[in-house]
Interface confidence: low
């Protein structure tokens, strides 16, 4: 979890009760609490978007919010790979990309997010309510997976919210590492909470700067990483009727929309638990001006300040020349 995560704005204390210094110390425990709860808890977000211009078009985007290095990303449909899902694409940060019909184009958007272009092909045609899952294998966190699909009543041009169904194969090293890093902060937090326990707890309010709207600063803090918002369109046949896979490149220019991470209880589960893991439905969606549906109160994913972009479909460390990494 990135440390620049947004924290809900706090209700200012009543005038006269506390000065500026007191307000700062009141905010600090909540900042630390957020970090203690979320730091070291990676998240996977998944977004499925249908284009308004082409009713049969989808874009699937997935991202990993964690500090570890990604070793492999697997995108599947029809459920997680271990529970009847079928692999659509596998992306390796150094060795390249593999994809299968009906996948048209898989690509890295950033070091920690990918997008997938799909198009139905015969019996492989997915329906509008098809579930797409992304699994990120990362060190030291382990493997994390989340699934998403378009709501049955989705309007064209709008995207489904990131759907939470994170599946963790916990990595002991990750757990121990996170524990060590957080120990000091959490002890300090308890100390501060004890000092402030006689004060009334502040009421949480939604941030005044709407966290539902895509924000370039939060989404792409560095100048280079602003290109991460340049997203390809996708194509999928949603009618569940046979379709022919053609070879033309997808149409469309940049789509300036951001996605939000999943927020759900991350519980350790083995692959056997995938089949029984329900994919909860999400409610309370807020429409935003650019056609993004987002859950109220959620924040956009963060990319690190040192983010390197890999628009080349061959991946981030693709070598040049005919013998380069493919």
């Amino acid at each position: 979890m990135r440390t620049e995560a947004q924290v809900p704005a706090l209700q200012p204390p009543e005038p006269g009760l506390e000065g500026a210094m007191g307000h700062r110390t009141l905010v600090l425990p909540w900042v630390l609490l957020t970090l203690c709860v979320t730091a070291g808890t990676p998240e996977v977000w998944v977004q499925v978007r249908m284009e308004a211009t082409e009713l049969s078009s989808f874009t699937i985007r997935c991202g990993f919010l964690g500090s570890g290095s990604i070793s492999l990303v697997t995108v599947s449909w029809g459920g997680p790979n271990g529970a009847g899902g079928t692999t659509l694409a596998v992306l390796h940060p150094e060795r390249g990309i593999r994809q299968w019909a009906p996948a048209r184009q898989a690509r890295w958007e950033t070091q920690s997010s990918i997008s997938l272009i799909l198009e139905g092909s015969g019996a492989s045609s997915p329906c509008a309510n098809t579930t797409f899952c992304c699994k990120f294998a990362s060190f030291p966190e382990g493997s994390w997976e989340a699934c998403g699909s378009l709501p049955p009543s989705s309007d064209p041009g709008l995207s489904a919210p990131p759907t939470p169904a994170p599946i963790l194969r916990a990595d002991l090293a990750g757990i121990l590492g996170v524990s060590g890093v957080l120990l000091f902060g959490c002890v300090y937090l308890l100390h501060l909470l004890r000092r402030h326990k006689h004060r009334p707890a502040p009421r949480l309010q939604p941030s005044r700067t709407s966290p539902q709207a895509p924000r370039a600063r939060a989404w792409a803090p560095s100048q280079a990483s602003q290109a991460a918002l340049h997203v390809p369109y996708a194509t999928i046949n949603t009618s569940c009727r046979p379709a022919t896979l053609d070879t033309a490149h997808p149409h469309g220019g940049p789509s300036w929309w951001a996605s939000l991470p999943t927020h759900a209880a991350h519980r350790p589960q083995g692959p056997a638990a995938w089949a029984s893991t329900p994919i909860p439905a999400r409610g309370s969606f807020v429409s935003v001006e650019n056609g993004l549906y987002a859950q109220a109160g959620e924040r956009p994913p963060h990319t690190g300040p040192g983010l390197t972009l890999f628009p080349d479909p061959r991946g981030p460390r693709a070598m040049e020349g005919p013998l380069g990494v493919r």
């Epitope: 070793s71 492999l72 593999r98 294998a137 070598m319």
Partner: antibody, heavy 121, light 112 residues
Framework: QVQLVQSGAEVKKPGASVKVSCKVS????????MHWVRQVPGKGLEWLGG????????IPAQKFQGRLTMTEDTSTETAYMELSSLRSEDTAVYYC??????????????WGPGTLVTVSS | DVVMTQSPLSLPVTPGGPASISCRSS???????????VDWYLQKPGQSPQLLIS???DRASGVPDRFSGSGSGTDFTLKISRVEAEDVGIYYC?????????FGQGTRLEIK
């Protein structure tokens, strides 16, 4: 539709060379790496060579080092495999295939139809 | 080189019945990323091989769900829950952990 189209059957004499082509359509050759696999009639599959990220390029299996050359022409989206110093035991069906990857488990998702190379005096 | 050993080499089955093919590697195919780099292919008579299972257990697109892959490390299994006539051919396991990439000897599945 993704397709790999290979050149026609060849009959060669021992000691000669053979060059098999594999033209791809439906995807860009620059986004995929080509591997070559052969199958002696009635026998199993044998990997000749292909892309190895550890080496940073296309490499032959050690067994074929020195007499196997793999090249690609991205302008025509065609891959080539040339095997020299042919012996009778090189008689086999030669397949081009995309997607076998070293140390990453990429499967071969597309195969050419195969080119029968017969080495006979 | 990693040696892939398949068994049985010949597998006669009755239509509708189950089938199981074993593949053993001379060294572990489990990578640090947690994936097993073994793939299964079916070569039907007169055709090129076609992908069935990748990364040990991920069924390829368009492959019927009666096919499943399992196993980890050095022991892998391909199962067909209900064999159909169209499933006849030679099944190969392949390791992609290191070069040279190697295949099993193949298992010929035939209908009784």
């Amino acid at each position: 539709q993704v397709q790999l189209v290979q050149s026609g059957a060849e009959v060669k004499k021992p000691g000669a060379s053979v060059k098999v082509s594999c033209k791809v359509s439906g995807f860009s050759l620059s986004h995929f790496s080509m591997h070559w696999v052969r199958q002696v009639p009635g026998k199993g599959l044998e990997w000749l060579g292909g892309f190895d990220p550890e080496e940073g390029g296309t490499i032959p299996a050690q067994k074929f080092q020195g007499r196997l050359t793999m090249t690609e022409d991205t302008s025509t989206e065609t891959a080539y495999m040339e095997l020299s110093s042919l012996r009778s035991e090189d008689t086999a069906v030669y397949y081009c295939a995309t997607g076998i990857w070293y140390s990453s488990g990429w499967p071969v998702d597309y195969w050419g139809p195969g080119t029968l190379v017969t080495v006979s005096s | 080189d990693v040696v892939m050993t398949q068994s049985p080499l010949s597998l006669p089955v009755t239509p509708g019945g189950p089938a199981s093919i074993s593949c053993r590697s001379s060294q572990s195919l489990l990578d640090s990323s947690g994936y097993n780099y073994v793939d299964w292919y079916l070569q039907k008579p007169g055709q090129s091989p076609q992908l069935l299972i990748s990364l040990g257990s991920d069924r390829a697109s368009g492959v019927p769900d009666r096919f499943s892959g399992s196993g980890s490390g050095t022991d892998f299994t391909l199962k067909i829950s209900r064999v159909e006539a169209e499933d006849v051919g030679i099944y190969y396991c392949m390791q992609a952990l290191q070069t040279p990439i190697t295949f099993g000897q193949g298992t010929r599945l035939e209908i009784k």
